[in-house]
């Protein structure tokens, strides 16, 4: 009778609660990776940034993988991707090679199955950083919503890597899953 | 028989629908706070902005609290945080104190339990706003994914607050919960 | 007995799985629209951009509609809206009409029921693009969390449309639903 219904309902609810928590609330992939300043490339040409923290300070990762400088997707889905990149120069670091700079970020997706790399988002600015100012700073932010498949890799390319701000609040990128693929 | 199954299924589904709606679809915290222009500090030094609207125009808040100039977290979780800050100056407002400016935003997290403040995100640019142009404008956008605990507080610091654009579409910050903490 | 409980539980779980997938994981509206470069307006005045791709490359749409240059909301909810707009100029394209530019984006919401248009977000910068540099570039990113009702329309206005970067990774806007309205 009613006892049987209550027992079964508890059993169903319990299993559902487990399933819901597992499938939705706690298994949704995300990553927030912050720049590893001990290994920033020099120079002014466009380079891929391969050194990022994933487990210290604000950096964290769940149900995604960080390997060989790339953020690897483990779960198909639609993700919001973002990047914040800060550049700075102080006169005490010596003169810039040129006062006309192109400060750029490119968020790229690489597919292993079909070896190809494509830019998902780009942003930045040309800047004139004159010697009259003791300090220069500039930040770029990009973000967008993309379909990502398991095994695909996200990486960050920048121009002028030697000018990157090494603080964890300044130079970072990340992703979080919003939705399954239909 | 089948009637008993249908009745019980309806009962289970009903309770689950209520639970799901309550727990997921409608109880997810968020805030979108817009600048209160009646109380913007003067000067050029870095200050914390304490006057924001939470219930007029585009501004809104749910399952979070706005108090003493800070956005207070009421529910543990992973949140996407964002800020958009616009600066402007018109020659009719008089000369700038200096033509070399540092226009910056800092999104900070304060923990009451361990009284400490940390910058989660920063962005901005140094600018040369010469007297040759009648009008100057610059916007900063930052965003990122962070673990926030109940009781923690989010606040916004800017340089040159007297140059802030007071429009609700220009200067705002916000947060929305994406995911529970494992 | 236990067989009956298992059968009914499977039936309940099954229906719930369908409902959950339908209602949450796969029916959440989103759009990511990329600039259609074949139809960018000329000039430097503020214009509404009406030509966007919704089904090629990174562009995609689900449970929203793109019509007459506007992104139409089909489902009430709280959405995260974003835009990334890139401007560029190369000296080989001829001289700029003026070296002092205002490069801006406005994300607007139009309600059909009450014919009115309001700016949700704006961003940009005044720039001095001198003839001393062969190439100029600048990107704007804005994002925010807004309540949208079915039938409301999102559109993008920019200044200096002739300077827009036509790449899909450069000039785009989008939205994804985060939460139901209480």
């Amino acid at each position: 009778g009613s006892q049987h219904i209550r027992a079964e309902k508890a059993m169903v609810d319990g299993s559902w609660l487990d399933l819901a928590k597992r499938s939705k609330l706690e298994a949704q992939p995300f990553a927030h990776l912050t720049i590893n300043a001990t290994d920033i490339p020099s120079g002014s040409h466009k380079v891929s940034l391969s050194s990022w923290y994933h487990d210290r300070g604000w950096a964290k990762i769940s149900n995604m993988t960080f390997s060989n400088g790339k953020l690897i997707v483990n779960q198909d889905g639609f993700y919001y991707l973002y990047a914040n990149i800060c550049f700075r120069h102080h006169e005490t670091s010596g003169d810039l090679a040129t006062e006309y700079l192109q400060l750029m970020v490119y968020v790229t997706k690489t597919s292993i199955k079909i070896p190809s790399s494509h830019t998902l988002m780009k942003g930045g600015s040309t800047k004139y950083w004159s010697g009259n100012s003791e300090f220069h700073f500039y930040s770029i932010n990009v973000g967008g919503f993309f379909k990502l498949r398991s095994g695909e890799e996200i990486s960050i390319e920048v121009s002028n890597p030697s000018l990157l701000d090494p603080d964890q609040d300044a130079t970072y990128f990340g992703a979080f899953k919003v939705r399954d693929i239909d | 028989g089948s009637q008993h199954i249908r009745a019980e299924k309806a009962m289970v589904d009903g309770s689950w629908l209520d639970l799901a709606k309550r727990s997921k679809l409608e109880a997810q915290p968020f805030a979108h706070l817009t600048i209160n222009a009646t109380d913007i500090p003067s000067g050029s030094h870095k200050v914390s902005l304490s006057s924001w609207y939470h219930d007029r125009g585009w501004a809104k808040i749910s399952n979070m609290t706005f108090s003493n100039g800070k956005l207070i977290v009421n529910q543990d979780g992973f949140y996407y945080l964002y800020a958009n800050i616009c600066f402007r100056h018109h020659e009719t407002s008089g000369d700038l104190a200096t033509e070399y400016l540092q226009l910056m935003v800092y999104v900070t997290k304060t923990s009451i339990k361990i009284p400490s403040s940390h910058t989660l995100m920063k962005g901005g640019s140094t600018k040369y706003w010469s007297g040759n142009s009648e009008f100057h404008f610059y916007s900063i956008n930052v965003g990122g994914f962070f673990k926030l605990r109940s009781g923690e507080e989010i606040s916004i610091e800017v340089s040159n607050p007297s140059l802030l654009d007071p429009d609700q579409d220009a200067t705002y910050f916000g947060a929305f919960k994406v995911r529970d903490i494992d | 007995g236990s067989q009956h409980i298992r059968a009914e539980k499977a039936m309940v779980d099954g229906s719930w799985l369908d409902l959950a997938k339908r209602s949450k994981l796969e029916a959440q509206p989103f759009a990511h629209l990329t600039i259609n470069a074949t139809d960018i307006p000329s000039g430097s005045h503020k214009v509404s951009l009406s030509s966007w791709y919704h089904d090629r490359g990174w562009a995609k749409i689900s449970n929203m509609t793109f019509s007459n240059g506007k992104l139409i909301v089909n489902q009430d909810g709280f959405y995260y809206l974003y835009a990334n707009i890139c401007f560029r100029h190369h000296e080989t394209s001829g001289d700029l009409a003026t070296e002092y530019l205002q490069l801006m984006v406005y994300v607007t919401k139009t309600s059909i029921k009450i014919p009115s248009s309001h700016t949700l977000m704006k961003g940009g910068s005044t720039k001095y693009w001198s003839g001393n540099s062969e190439f100029h570039f600048y990107s704007i990113n804005v994002g925010g969390f807004f309540k949208l009702r079915s039938g409301e329309e999102i559109s993008i206005e920019v200044s200096n449309p002739s300077l827009l970067d036509p790449d899909q990774d450069a000039t785009y806007f989008g939205a994804f639903k985060v939460r139901d309205i209480d």
Epitope: R88, T92, F135 | H45, K46, Y100, Q102, T126 | -
Partner: nanobody
Framework: EVQLVESGGKLVQAGGSLRLSCAVS????????MAWFRQGPGKGRESVGR????????YYADSVKGRFTISRDNATNTVYLQMNSLKPEDTAVYYC?????????????WGQGTQVTVSS
């Protein structure tokens, strides 16, 4: 806190020289660098040059390079601005300023200013 007091400003003929002094007192150990600024009549404040506390390195605005020199006397905690080949456009109120952090254009401490007038 750090206190700054400028002196040495006066009327001088074009082509002449002048030395301004800035006496620094208080928590001088917190200073990252010291700078001289000037504000001409009807103009915004502009940087003239800077000296770094750690190594006494100096940097100058293009408009004064080769004519102005910044130096420091550690014993008396005084910063100097030696101005040679003065021009009428150098007429301004000159301020010394100090700051405590590297990555900022905002100076934390300011003197009251001293007037320099260059007549033609």
């Amino acid at each position: 806190e750090v206190q700054l007091v400028e002196s040495g400003g006066k009327l001088v003929q074009a082509g002449g020289s002048l030395r301004l002094s800035c006496a620094v007192s208080g928590r001088t150990s917190s200073i990252y660098n010291m700078a001289w600024f000037r504000q001409g009549p009807g103009k915004g404040r502009e940087s003239v040059g800077r000296i770094y506390w750690s190594d006494d390195n100096t940097y100058y605005a293009d408009s004064v390079k080769g004519r102005f020199t910044i130096s420091r006397d550690n014993a008396t905690n005084t910063v100097y601005l030696q101005m040679n080949s003065l021009k009428p456009e150098d007429t301004a109120v000159y301020y010394c300023a100090g700051k405590t952090t590297k990555w900022s254009l905002e100076y934390d401490y300011w003197g009251q200013g001293t007037q320099v007038t260059v007549s033609s």
